[in-house]
C-alpha cells in the first residue's frame, strides 16, 4: 500500500536505506513530498516485525517498485493508490 | 556467537517420517524468520520452507507443501521440519538458516546442516 | 516460480585474475538477488545481498551489481582461499530460488 502525507512536521528521516526490500516484508509504504518544513521528499517503510526504515528516495529498488505499483493501480483500479491525508 | 544446530537426520526407508530440528542460540529467534534449505549430493541449494515468528505465515516449495511441514517452538528456541512419505530424492543435506528481515533480508546465518537418507 | 540461470557452471581460474559470475532471473526480480559462497563440507555463507551491497567482513575484492533480471558477481584478484562454489538466489518473492552454482577451481 502506498501512501501520500501532506504534514506540518520538520523531516522525519535522519538515516536512509537504500537496500532492497522484499514486499512479504513490507506492511506499508508511506510517502511524504517535499515541503511544509523539510526540503526533501521522504519515503518510509512500515515493515510486519514493526519496524521502519526510511529509504532513500533514489534508491533504484524503490524506484522499480513504485513504477510496478503505479502501473499495476493505474490498470486496475478506477482511482490511484495514493491515499492523501490532510491534517 | 550465533549458533544454528540441525538434528533428527538419519537413514530412512521410501514412504517413511522424520522429524528434523533446528536449536538456535545467540540471537532473539522469536524475532525472525526461518527457513529450511536442502542440498542433494553433488547438487545445488534448493529452498524448501520458511514461517515467520508468529508462525501466521508459511511458505513452501509448490513441490513440498504437500509433504513438508514447517514449524517453531519461540519458547525453546527451535525449528522444526516435519518430513512425511519421504522419496528417495529427499536424499540431503537439510540446512536451516535465518531469514533476516531488519537490515539484509537474506539467509544470513546456516547451520552445519544434517544428512537425510532415503532408502530401501 | 522465478528460475535463476547461473553461469558459468564451473570456471578455472589463477591466482590474482579477475572472476565473473552471472546469473540470470526468468523475471524482474528488482534489486533482490544475494550471493552465498559455499565450501565443501560447510554449510553456504552469505558475501553480497540486495544485489550489491557487501555482507559484514566480507573482502572488498568481492563484488556484486545489478538489478530487474541481469545480475553479476565478481571477484577482482582471486585468491586460493576463493576456491568454493557460489550461489545467486532471489528474494524477490518466494518460492526462494537459487541458481544451479559455479564452482571455481585454481588453474
Known amino acids: 500500500v502506498l501512501e501520500v502525507y501532506y504534514t506540518s512536521l520538520r523531516c522525519r528521516c535522519v538515516q536512509e536505506s537504500s537496500v532492497f526490500i522484499p514486499r512479504r516484508f513490507i506492511d506499508r509504504i508511506q510517502i511524504l513530498p517535499r515541503g511544509n518544513g523539510c526540503p526533501r521528499k521522504e519515503i518510509i517503510v512500515w515493515k510486519k516485525n514493526k519496524s521502519i526504515v526510511c529509504v532513500d528516495p533514489q534508491a533504484e529498488w524503490i524506484q522499480r517498485m513504485m513504477e510496478v505499483l503505479r502501473k499495476r493501480s493505474s490498470s486496475t483500479l478506477p482511482v490511484p493508490v495514493f491515499k492523501r491525508k490532510i491534517p | 556467537e550465533v549458533q544454528l544446530v540441525e538434528s533428527g537426520g538419519g537413514l530412512v526407508q521410501p514412504g517413511g517420517s522424520l522429524r528434523l530440528s533446528c536449536a538456535a542460540s545467540?540471537?532473539?529467534?522469536?524475532?525472525?524468520?526461518m527457513s529450511w534449505v536442502r542440498q542433494a549430493p553433488g547438487k545445488g541449494l534448493e529452498w524448501v520452507a520458511e514461517?515467520?515468528?508468529?508462525?501466521?505465515?508459511?511458505n513452501y516449495a509448490p513441490s513440498l507443501k504437500d509433504r513438508f511441514t514447517i514449524s517453531r517452538d519461540n519458547a525453546k528456541n527451535s525449528l522444526y521440519l516435519q518430513m512425511n512419505s519421504l522419496r528417495a530424492e529427499d536424499t540431503a543435506v537439510y540446512y536451516c538458516?535465518?531469514?533476516?528481515?531488519?537490515?539484509?533480508?537474506?539467509?544470513?546465518?546456516w547451520g552445519q546442516g544434517t544428512t537425510v537418507t532415503v532408502s530401501s | 516460480d522465478i528460475q535463476m540461470t547461473q553461469s558459468p557452471s564451473s570456471l578455472s581460474a589463477s591466482v590474482g585474475d579477475r572472476v565473473t559470475i552471472t546469473c540470470k532471473a526468468s523475471?524482474?526480480?528488482?534489486?533482490?538477488v544475494y550471493w552465498y559462497q559455499q565450501k565443501p563440507g560447510k554449510a553456504p555463507k552469505l558475501l553480497i545481498y540486495s544485489a550489491s551491497y557487501r555482507y559484514t567482513g566480507v573482502p572488498s575484492r568481492f563484488s556484486g551489481s545489478g538489478s530487474g533480471t541481469d545480475f553479476t558477481f565478481t571477484i577482482s584478484s582471486l585468491q586460493p582461499e576463493d576456491i568454493a562454489t557460489y550461489y545467486c538466489?532471489?528474494?524477490?518473492?518466494?518460492?526462494?530460488?537459487f541458481g544451479g552454482g559455479t564452482k571455481l577451481e585454481i588453474k
Open positions: 545467540g540471537i532473539d529467534f522469536s524475532r525472525y524468520w
Open positions: 538458516a535465518r531469514q533476516e528481515d531488519y537490515e539484509y533480508y537474506a539467509l544470513d546465518y
Open positions: 523475471q524482474d526480480v528488482n534489486t533482490g
Open positions: 514461517i515467520n515468528p508468529e508462525s501466521s505465515t508459511i
Open positions: 538466489q532471489q528474494g524477490y518473492s518466494t518460492p526462494l530460488t
